[in-house]
């Protein structure tokens, strides 16, 4: 039978004895096969980290900062339940640390040295630690003690709770700097009015702190948040402009057989139980003997964090890079306003070969990152492990929903100014063999499908989007007989087709041959029925332009395309026979690197990019013999987005509007996790 | 397509030094990048050290200071000059000139270089 008790670790007497309490109440209401609670007592959160890491105990609830020291080694536990405040249809898992100024004053986050800056309270969160953390590197040399370093950096502060002795200036604007609210500018209400009142030039407080002390917008609209990108904007738009976004309040367990499902069933039970209104015998969110034991008094509920999330993503890039900052005290040496090198993210062997040569042929400005999805490759540039790659446009809404933004877009299409002019988009078409000549658009239930993967554009989103309006469910492996969509689940019909050996079956990368563009044709021309690709796939492939064997003898004349009032048309003919048209792939890349990658894959081109005649002598960015790896081959130049910035802008709002609709039947474990940080 | 064939490796003391040679069978003048990989039990292969036509090299943070690459285009030779060698060195080195493409994995036998007291 399995162990079905969740060990609960409490830290304080009071702790243990509201844990008991839990522990009696669930027994009282829960069948004896469901989940029950056993109480852990020890000295400190750190402790309860230890322990659980031990398999001494298996759950804890932690602050943000904690929830970092629990996932670093040897700890390594992830998050698997958030606290929710406000309601049930608005919760709340996160708040947003901001910087405020006023309207008028005309500076920005890179331009902070000088001013005077109101905190809420020395180490505290976003008053401090945050705001401190991302900016350490400015900080004068030498950076400890950290005070003093604050103290040269700011011409004056309100850092409440700091030593008014030894760092006079820390309490400049708020003399005695008194670590309670007898001292006005202490808080977050405190460090508000220290920027109100005209003391400060900056405050570092929540997203909420401006709202529940101007309750008129009028009033509001004086002031401006300082986003991390150098620019400012309205007050209310705090999640695109703010400097992290941090978790309230989360219930940590082990990575590795963490009992994530059944903490979830266990909380869930509770919340049902004895959550807020419930009970009066038992309140899960009540602390008669202290305040905040267990879970927070103020938590309204729980929500499952998706299993995909690890600490790093929970936390986020922004969070993790400032508490990283103050904890190791580490900075690049390099100036800051020099360009790292980019380190590319590459999918599986085949494309890091290929990374690997342009890395030494770039002389220091690429390096490569390995990665086996494309899932993969946007969490690790979410969380810096890499900086970016060039996405299909579903990738790309993924990545945009994780924080991610479109810098250069690939242009197909010779012209004379092809870097300042981004393409309208290319065609999605469906191909069948000719000879197969009874097959349409509108008959294609039962038949072998072969797709570029799921979450592409023309291998998967438009297709699949257009079906689903036909058919209405999500079953699309029920819909065709058998097929190859890499990414399926391994025992689903939609990985049957597919030609991967081994734990390479159905991979979405280019381990598995029927992968991508050139794979789903290959898929077509060896097992299936039709191809969902782009428009320009047929003729790279026939015509003896692929020389692999299953290629070199392939004709064009021989496929043709489905259109979608039923009939079917030559393969030339696309522009009056596709699916729909497809926003052009493009390279995505965290905020804060936006600049630097525009910069450097613009001096890359032009060292390698299609002005190189001869590429058997040189090394050449936009080919890989038909393969697609990191750029597509037909890849002509990169081009500037102008004002098509934002994933929105850059995909468009039908094709977003598209892909929200499938969004019912995703399976992307990464989309789960974004929206559950971002809805 | 040239067929590239190592040697140079062999047994060899922590601290010690190797110089892996890899023959290419025609010319590498107008190869634009030769790099030399290794593979350890278990790992995946990973770059070692690159150089372009130019001569432009690059490699990995774990052999800076100690390794050099060096091609002789007469001798249609690349070289590896591995000095301060450590136990993690020990794996399995093979050079390649990119030719054959990123996607068939052409890679020759490759030489054994262990590095043990």
């Known amino acids: 039978v399995p162990d079905k008790t969740v060990r609960w670790c409490a830290v304080s007497e009071h702790e243990a004895t509201k844990c008991q309490s839990f522990r009696d109440h669930m027994k009282s209401v829960i069948p004896s096969d469901g989940p029950s609670v056993a109480c852990v007592k020890k000295a400190s959160y750190l402790d309860c980290i230890r322990a659980i890491a031990a398999n001494e105990a298996d759950a804890v609830t932690l602050d943000a900062g904690l929830v970092y020291d629990a996932y670093l080694a040897p700890n390594n536990l992830k998050p698997v339940v958030a606290e929710f405040y406000g309601s049930k249809e608005d919760p709340q898992t996160f708040y947003y640390a901001v910087a405020v100024v006023k309207k008028d004053s005309g500076f920005q986050m890179n331009q902070l040295r000088g001013k005077k800056s109101c905190h809420t309270g020395l180490g505290r969160s976003a008053g401090w630690n945050i705001p401190i953390g991302l900016l350490y590197c400015d900080l004068p040399e030498p950076r400890k003690p950290l005070e003093k370093a604050v103290a040269n950096f700011f011409s004056g502060s309100c850092a409440p709770c700091a030593d008014g002795t030894d760092f006079p200036q820390l309490c400049q604007l708020c003399p005695g700097c008194g670590c309670s609210t007898l001292n006005q500018y202490f808080g977050y209400s405190g460090a508000f009015k220290c920027l109100k009142d005209g003391a400060g030039d900056v405050a570092f407080v929540k997203h909420s702190t401006i709202f529940e002390n101007l309750a008129n917008k009028a009033d509001r609209d004086q002031y401006e948040l300082l986003c991390l990108d150098n620019t400012r904007k309205p007050v209310d738009e705090y999640k695109d402009c703010h400097l992290a976004q941090v978790p309230s309040h989360t219930v940590v367990a082990r990575s590795m057989g963490g009992k994530e499902d059944l903490i979830w069933e266990l909380l869930n039970q509770a919340q049902e139980h004895f959550g807020k209104d419930k009970s009066k015998e038992f309140q899960l969110f009540s602390s008669p003997h202290g305040k905040d034991l267990l879970f927070k008094d103020s938590a309204h509920g729980f929500l499952k964090v998706p299993p995909r999330m690890d600490a790093k993503m929970y936390l986020g890039y922004e969070y993790v890079t400032a508490i990283r900052n103050l904890r190791e005290g580490t900075c690049p040496e390099a100036p800051t306003d020099e360009c790292k090198p980019v380190k590319w993210c590459a999918l599986s062997h085949h494309e890091r070969l290929k990374c690997d040569e342009w890395s030494v042929n770039s002389v220091g400005k690429i390096e490569c990152v390995s990665a086996e999805t494309t899932e993969d490759c946007i969490a690790k540039i979410m969380n810096g492990e890499a900086d970016a790659m060039s996405l299909d446009g579903g990738f790309v809404y993924i990545a945009g929903k994780c924080g991610l933004v479109p810098v250069l877009a690939e242009n197909y299409n010779k012209s004379d100014n092809c870097e300042d002019t981004p393409e309208a988009g290319y065609f999605a078409i469906a191909v069948v063999k000719k000879s197969a000549s009874d097959l349409t658009w509108d008959n294609l239930k039962g038949k072998k499908s072969c797709h570029t993967a799921v979450g592409r554009t023309a291998g998967w989103n438009i297709p699949m989007g257009l079906l689903y309006n036909k058919i209405n469910h999500c079953r699309f492996d029920e819909f065709f007989s058998e097929g190859c969509a890499p990414g399926s689940k391994k025992d689903s019909s939609l990985c049957k087709l597919c030609m991967g050996s081994g734990l390479n079956l159905c991979e979405p990368n280019n381990k598995e041959g029927y992968y991508g563009y050139t794979g789903a044709f290959r898929c077509l021309v060896e097992k299936g029925d039709v191809a969902f690709v782009k428009h320009q796939t047929v003729p790279q492939n026939t015509g003896g332009k692929n020389p692999d064997p299953w290629a070199k003898n392939l004709n064009e004349k021989d496929y043709e395309l489905l259109c979608l009032d039923g009939t079917r048309k030559p393969v030339e003919e696309y522009a009056n026979c596709h699916l729909a048209r497809a926003p052009n792939h493009a390279v995505v890349t965290r905020k804060d690197k936006e600049a630097c990658v525009h910069k450097i894959l613009r001096q890359q081109q032009h060292l390698f990019g299609s002005n190189v005649t001869d590429c058997s002598g040189n090394f050449c960015l936009f080919r890989s013999e038909t393969k697609d790896l990191l750029f597509r081959d037909d890849t002509v130049c990169l081009a500037k987005l102008h004002d098509r910035n934002t994933y929105e802008k850059y995909l468009g709002e039908e094709y977003v509007k598209a892909v929200g609709n499938l969004r019912k039947c995703s399976t992307s474990s990464l989309l789960e996790a974004c929206t559950f940080r971002r809805p | 397509h040239v067929q590239l064939v190592e040697s140079g490796g062999g047994l060899v003391q922590p601290g010690g030094s190797l110089r892996l040679s890899c023959v290419a069978s025609g010319s590498i003048a107008s190869v634009a990048t030769m790099a030399w990989y290794r593979q350890a039990p278990g790992q995946q292969r990973e770059l070692v050290a690159g150089?372009?036509?130019?001569?432009?090299?690059k490699y990995a943070d774990s052999v800076k200071g100690r390794f050099t690459i060096s091609r002789d285009n007469a001798k249609n030779t690349l070289y590896l000059q591995m000095n301060s060698l450590k136990p993690e060195d020990t794996a399995v080195y093979y050079c390649t000139d990119y030719s054959r493409g990123y996607y068939q994995d052409y890679w020759g036998q490759g030489i054994q270089v262990t590095v043990s007291s």
């Open positions: 150089i372009t036509r130019g001569g432009s090299t």
